[in-house]
């Protein structure tokens, strides 16, 4: 039979690290180029939607997000090709019948417009001018993204490390 | 119409960052702990597999990927609960007709003993004890892990960014 | 071991078929794009034919449109490509090589020895 | 599809030489430029990614520089395991294209 869900106790105790200076990543790795606080990796080969996360999240990273308006005009402003399309990380929740960030936030309305079906197994990619929605299944390139975060963090001693 | 999937042409020129050595995470950050090369971060909330494997993205981390024996019995002696279930990044390929982790290596024979179905929609949980299958849309909890990397690596200057 | 070794390299007439294998080991096979590369007896190199880590998108070179099929087996962690319509001028040693990241085509680090394939009649 | 050209097509140096080799692409290609060894009866080796990363295990007298369409291979202190021919090879877009190839001979 299998285990219940049920109330978390992990022993962190015995597996603490000293308490250093955590230097966070100062400037972007080979592949990936900076465009403000993230570093992006544009590929070049293609995926469906659930590889394209599934590789971004083994690269240590996350399929793109968004924050506004000027967010998507700077990432479509290096779309070079206007036959290139990209997976970002925002597919349709059916069960909560919305747009949803892999971050588990809702696209509110205000936000990117999407063209396309709103319905199952439908992921959205961006193009140098619009963004689109698709079936997740479709093969096309990705975004991945890391935070690039300049200001090194103390880690407090008494924290979970 | 939708942009078709062709050649990619991304600007990478204008988007340089200096060349700065780049320190790599030299310790785990608050809520995660040290097990050997990985820093882990074992969920308090539940969710299904997939949405598991969206937060270990956005979190720019992996579900878990356990090399071997000694890795899951290191992982199973820090769960204290034994009716407490975690994700791992393990899931049915139905297409492969196999187990196959997030970074695309398949189970081999002598790795995890799973007990449950091989069959679609099946995903892959341990225990304190055991490593389970279970349908995908199970709310559970989850384990992401970072590599632990104590080299610094140099960025080449005329490299990209 | 990381390792791709070809098979299935020999001598065919013009206008015949050759089916080449390519087995990979000791890496996550279906994570990568996987190319063939050949070089004929004493030339350079010259890119064949790219196929997507699950399979679905196919790339070759002008000089074998039509003729060759690029396909993969994740689950034997194989790669294969058909050659139909054989001519002279596709004698070479056909390589398959893995890109150093998973995210693209090229920047090969892995390469496998080789197979001959010499179209004669 | 996108032309390189390299130059020298061969070379003659010594060991201790430093020796350069020149890629030319008829279009941009930023940094997507890679630079192969290859000894003969043997597969090519990956020695330079992304214009100038050096690919591990690869000594450091192998260096790469440029972007856009002029690329340079330079080896500081030729060897005698060195003497090979060089391939650069494109990859921003497809079809992938190599350079025509570059001997490194013995003086």
């Known amino acids: 039979q299998k285990p219940s869900i049920g109330k978390c106790s992990v022993d962190i105790q015995q597996n603490r690290t000293k308490t250093t200076e955590r230097p966070d990543l100062l400037n972007c790795p080979i592949y990936w180029q900076q465009v403000q606080e993230k570093c992006l990796l544009f590929s070049h080969t293609v995926n469906p939607w659930n590889n394209s996360l599934a590789d971004c999240s083994t690269k240590e990273s996350s399929l793109l997000l968004i924050q506004d308006k000027d967010e998507l005009t700077r990432t479509q402003n290096l779309i070079h090709d206007k036959a290139i399309s990209f997976w970002i990380g925002l597919n349709f929740s059916l069960s909560e019948k919305n747009w949803k960030w892999i971050n588990g936030s809702f696209l509110s309305s205000n936000d990117l417009k999407i063209t396309g079906d709103a319905k199952e197994n439908s992921c959205v990619y961006i193009s140098q001018t619009s963004v689109y929605s698709e079936y997740c299944s479709t093969e096309m390139k990705w975004i991945c993204q890391k935070e690039l975060t300049l200001v090194r963090n103390k880690v407090s001693p008494d924290s979970w490390l | 119409q939708k942009p078709s999937i062709g050649k990619c042409s991304v600007d990478i020129q204008q988007n340089r960052t200096k060349t700065t050595e780049r320190p790599d995470l030299l310790n785990c950050p608050i809520y995660w702990q040290q097990v050997q090369e990985k820093c882990l971060l074992f969920s308090h909330t539940v969710n299904p597999w997939n949405n598991s494997l969206a937060d270990c993205s956005t979190k720019e981390s992996s579900l878990l990927l356990i090399q071997d024996k000694d890795e899951l019995t290191r992982t199973q002696n820090l769960i204290h609960d034994k009716a407490i279930s975690f994700w791992i990044g393990l899931n049915f390929s139905l297409s492969e007709k196999n187990w196959k982790w997030i970074n695309g290596s398949f189970l081999s024979s002598n790795d995890l003993k799973i007990t449950g179905d091989a069959k679609e929609n099946s995903c892959v949980y341990i225990s304190q004890t055991s490593v389970y299958s279970e349908y995908c849309s199970t709310e559970m909890k989850w384990i992401c892990q970072k590599e632990l990397t104590l080299v610094r690596n140099k960025v080449s200057p005329d490299s990209w960014l | 071991e990381v390792q791709l070794l070809e098979s299935g390299g020999g001598l065919v007439q013009p206008g015949g078929s050759l089916r080449l294998s390519c087995a990979a080991s000791?890496?996550?096979?279906?994570?990568?794009?996987m190319s063939w590369v050949r070089q004929a007896p004493g030339k350079g190199l010259e890119w064949v034919s790219a196929?997507?880590?699950?399979?679905?998108?196919?790339y070759y070179a002008d000089s074998v449109k039509g003729r060759f099929t690029i396909s993969r087996d994740n689950s034997k962690n194989t790669l294969y490509l058909q050659m139909n319509s054989l001519r002279a001028e596709d004698t070479a040693v056909y390589y398959c090589?893995?890109?150093?990241?998973?995210?693209?085509?090229?920047?090969?680090?892995?390469w496998g020895r080789g197979t001959l394939v010499t179209v004669s009649s | 599809d996108i032309q390189l050209t390299q130059s020298p097509s061969s070379v003659s140096a010594s060991v201790g030489d430093r020796v350069t080799i020149t890629c030319r692409a008829s279009?941009?290609?930023?940094?997507?430029l890679a630079w192969y060894q290859q000894k003969p009866g043997k597969a090519p080796k990956l020695l330079i990614y992304?214009?100038?990363s050096l690919q591990s295990g690869v000594p450091s007298r192998f260096s790469g520089s440029g972007s856009g369409t002029d690329f340079t291979l330079t080896i500081s202190s030729l060897q005698p395991e060195d003497f090979a021919t060089y391939y650069c090879?494109?990859?921003?877009?497809?079809?992938?294209?190599f350079g025509g190839g570059t001997k490194v001979e013995i003086k």
């Open positions: 090589a893995k890109p150093l990241d998973s995210s693209f085509w090229a920047d090969f680090d892995l």
């Open positions: 000791g890496f996550t096979f279906g994570t990568f794009a």
């Open positions: 196929i997507s880590g699950v399979g679905g998108t196919t």
């Open positions: 279009q941009t290609i930023s940094s997507w």
């Open positions: 992304a214009a100038s």
């Open positions: 090879q494109q990859q921003s877009v497809l079809p992938i294209t």
